[in-house]
């Protein structure tokens, strides 16, 4: 059951995993969410009544029966993981404490403007979990507009305490504002020889490589496959870390693979969700429960829905025994992953999918489309939305994207002459415009966000975000897609796409049926030699064949280029402007989204 | 069942004013546009403007933009006319129409507009 | 403004007959053109949508057709019931426009 709510003066009695130090009793549940074992916790808040050193300390719980008992005492605060509920978890905390010392070891020191240049530094550092600032009002001179950027082996203070005049504050790396590079690649036959900060067990180096992105002190990693020589060290997962934030040393070794934690692309890639199933293996750690089940997948979902479980073992029923059913053990560790894996004994494993929630949904996989043709298929481009005006008559005005599901991205230039977001309706999980009927569900737009820098298409900031009245429910024909990493500034897309109901030709009308094409990107210097009297700058991105013939065009404006990488589609490009549509030597200019995401989080974020 | 019942006739002086209504029931209101047009004797129709009664968002022909003026009274679902300077050429059937999802599809019975000194 | 031009005027068909009025729009309204018909004494009543489609309830003996610039509205066999105005209007841009109408006699 999911118990949102604070208990105030109430604490949970035993159960103790583990004690660590949080700014607030809110911060201290969502630390209590991304343990892989706390159910409970129980925070105290400063308090006269309260003896000063344990002010500030979060208890990690844990329990059997998913409860425990409640005791009244001043100051407490207790409540309960977000495990046990279906919403979106997000780590990013942008809250700044006042007056308060988070304590960890100080690395580094320097002179900044504001806290907020201070939080800037840190979420741009590879060490920097938290921070304090000295405010110009502190007391010692020497110590004013002093940056203390700080880490410590769980993310978390080793304690806190009050300081006049002083502010600390999380890294925003889990917000998706770290301008640190995102490198996505696992270098095979490589051990990085740094020092080991954990070791953990995982069948593929995937989920070594996720479960790096998640530990606090992990910059990268080194994983032992199931064929590495020694036998003790066989799936093992070593995480790592160096004063500089990169390996020192690269050793070539066969059977070894290593990378980087995918800290700065966490919010376009998923990180917590370990979807796929082993075959021929079992993991190894605490029994749970033995259920029988159909099938590994059946195993799977008896996993996710026991808030306890952290993985599982299937294995297949022998012939026509217990009516086809297998034994489905449900498992948890001290760390979430396995004691031990071990091969060749027909076992099929897996994770629990609740972590899924704790990942960006836009990282979900969509269906597989249909190469060539020009109709799109349902479902293919679940993000795609149809803009419609009433005014004068209701028509198709614009494409767009979900992004999150209160706000769709689409182009500024979309509005002109719309004078209330009120005669707008979004329509999702749309195919055909024909599908539309009077009494078609909609979303009706609360807000229209236009950058406040735009004046018209050609010269740049042609991005608008609407917020809708309701929330959109994700399903399989509508769910968002992410935005690009700022860390992947430098990736070549080479799978764009850009769809959209627009004209297939200058003078012609709105499609029906949504519409693809494959459009190759085009570099900026080369779109500025076709477009001589304009200013094509890096906030716009050009795409189009040299021939012509493929192209956006009137109607397509404010949707979405969208690229692949990784298995994940990511939102490149706003359709914007070009001359003409689909002509020779005249590729369609975008808004290039990368640019703008700071902007995009500003607002979809403020509060 | 969609209804839009119009005021009733009205007889004015040149220079004088009139506001006409449109009550609405059977559908949402304030989730549609309520158009005004007109229909001098003997002749076609004409366009006179539009209003969003959810937002007060308003459209003019510009022949009609100083004189008249579009409101809606969301809480008893009723749109509003008012033409001002009115003169001999405003005597007509006066109607309001809501603009469906593809067209105007429900009209009102019309109101009789006369000027006549 | 968007001109809508209609003919004829006025016309005169028996009964049986099928019968063609035509609008012809001063710039491209794509398909945002209806048709209304118009009995004496009555308000306008909606015939045809987006230029082809018939509208709730009304008989299938009335069509349209045309993108564009040009459209028409067809009677196929025309019945006593069908003498009144007929008028198109295009809803493409404001100012909202009508044709001057068409005038449907039986002979």
């Known amino acids: 059951e999911c118990v949102t709510q604070l208990l105030k003066d109430t604490c949970f009695e035993g159960g103790d995993i583990t004690t660590v130090f949080t700014p607030s009793a809110k911060y201290c549940q969502v630390v209590c969410t991304y343990h892989p074992r706390c159910l409970l916790f129980t925070f105290t808040a400063e308090s006269p009544s309260e003896d000063p050193t344990r002010w500030f300390t979060c208890v990690l719980k844990d329990s059997v029966t998913e409860t425990l008992p409640r005791v009244n005492r001043t100051a407490a605060i207790s409540g309960y993981s977000f495990k046990q509920c279906s919403h979106q978890i997000s780590a990013c905390n942008k809250d700044i404490y006042v007056d308060l010392d988070m304590k960890g070891i100080n690395y580094n020191s320097s002179v900044a403007k504001s806290a907020q240049e201070c939080q800037e530094r840190c979420t741009d550092d590879v060490h920097c979990h938290f921070f304090t600032y000295a405010t110009r009002q502190f007391p010692s001179l020497e110590h004013r507009n002093i940056c203390l950027l700080k880490h410590t082996q769980t993310g978390t203070p080793t304690r806190i305490t009050k300081l006049d005049k002083v502010v600390s504050g999380f890294s925003l790396k889990s917000c998706a504002l770290s301008n640190l590079a995102c490198i996505r690649d696992i270098f095979p036959n490589t051990v990085f020889a740094d020092s080991n900060i954990d070791s953990v067990m995982a069948p593929d180096a995937f989920v070594c490589g996720r479960i790096c992105t998640h530990h606090p002190g992990c910059l990268f990693f080194t994983f032992f496959s199931q064929e590495w020589p020694k036998e003790s060290q066989r799936n093992l997962c070593l995480l790592k870390t160096s004063e500089s934030g990169l390996p020192s040393t690269r050793i070539k070794k066969s059977k070894a693979l290593s990378g980087f934690s995918l800290q700065s692309c966490r919010h376009s890639i998923p990180v917590f969700c370990h979807s796929s199933f082993y075959h021929d293996t079992d993991f190894l750690g605490e029994e749970l429960d033995i259920v029988a089940a159909k099938s590994h997948e059946a195993c799977q979902k008896l996993c996710t829905n026991a808030v306890r479980c952290q993985f599982f073992t299937y294995t297949p029923a022998q012939a026509s025994c217990n009516e086809g059913k297998g034994k489905c053990y449900l498992k948890l560790s001290s760390n979430g992953s396995p004691t031990k894996i071990l091969h060749g004994r027909g076992g099929i494993s897996g994770y629990t999918l609740r972590l899924c929630k704790m990942d960006n949904e836009c990282t979900t996989k969509i269906k597989p489309r249909i190469v060539g043709g020009t109709a799109s298929v349902r479902g293919e481009w679940p993000w795609q939305v149809t803009l419609h005006t009433t005014s004068p008559t209701q028509r198709h005005l614009c494409g767009g994207s979900i992004i999150g599901n209160q706000w769709i991205l689409t182009a500024a230039h979309c509005f002109y002459g719309v004078e209330s977001p009120k005669i707008l309706r979004v329509y999702s999980g749309i195919l055909n415009q024909s599908e539309i009927k009077e009494d078609t569900s909609f979303f009706g737009v609360q807000e229209i966000i236009i950058h406040d820098q735009y004046k018209m298409a050609e010269s740049g900031y042609d991005i608008a975000l609407l917020k809708l009245e309701t929330t959109v429910n994700y399903t399989d024909s509508q769910r968002p897609i992410c935005l690009p990493s700022k860390g992947d500034r430098n990736v070549i897309y080479t799978d764009c796409w850009v769809t959209g109901w627009g004209y297939r030709k200058l003078r012609d009308k709105i499609q029906n049926t949504l519409q693809k094409a494959k459009i190759p990107l085009v570099t900026n210097e080369e779109c500025q030699k076709r477009y001589r009297g304009h200013k094509i700058t890096h906030k716009m991105i050009c795409a189009g064949y040299r021939e012509g013939g493929k192209d956006a065009c009137k109607g397509d404006s404010g949707g979405p280029l969208s690229c692949k990488h990784n298995e994940v589609w990511h939102l490149v490009g706003i359709t914007s402007w070009g001359e003409g549509c689909a002509q020779r030597e005249r590729p369609g200019v975008y808004t290039n989204v990368v640019e703008y995401v700071d902007w995009i989080l500003e607002k979809t974020q403020a509060v | 069942q969609v209804q839009l019942v119009q005021s009733g006739s009205e007889l004015k002086k040149p220079g004088a004013s009139v506001k006409l209504s449109c009550k609405a029931s059977?559908?949402?209101?304030?989730?549609?546009?309520m158009h005004w047009v007109r229909q001098a004797p003997g002749q076609g129709l004409e366009w006179i403007g539009n209003?969003?009664?959810?937002?007060?968002?308003?459209n003019y022909d510009e022949k009609f933009r100083t004189r008249v003026t579009l409101t809606a009274d969301t809480s008893t679902s009723t749109a509003y006319m008012e033409l001002s300077s009115l003169r001999s050429e405003d005597t007509a059937v006066y109607y309001c129409?809501?603009?469906?999802?593809?067209?105007?599809?429900?009209w009102g019975q019309g109101t009789t507009v006369t000027v006549s000194s | 403004d968007i001109v809508m031009t209609q003919s004829p005027s006025s016309l005169s068909a028996s009964v049986g007959d099928r019968v063609t009025i035509t609008c012809k729009a001063s710039?491209?309204?794509?398909?945002?053109v209806s048709w209304f018909q118009q009995k004496p004494g009555q308000a306008p009543k909606l015939l045809i949508y987006?230029?082809?489609n018939r509208y709730t309830g009304v008989p299938d003996r009335f069509s349209g057709s045309g993108s564009g610039t040009d459209f028409t509205l067809t009677i196929s066999s025309l019945q006593a019931e069908d003498v009144a105005d007929y008028h198109c209007?295009?809803?493409?841009?404001?100012?909202?426009?009508f044709g001057q109408g068409t005038k449907l006699e039986i002979k």
């Open positions: 129409t809501r603009m469906g999802f593809y067209a105007m599809d429900y």
């Open positions: 059977g559908y949402t209101f304030t989730r549609y546009w």
């Open positions: 209003i969003y009664p959810d937002s007060d968002s308003t």
């Open positions: 710039e491209n309204v794509v398909t945002y």
């Open positions: 987006g230029a082809s």
């Open positions: 209007g295009q809803s493409y841009s404001y100012p909202l426009t």
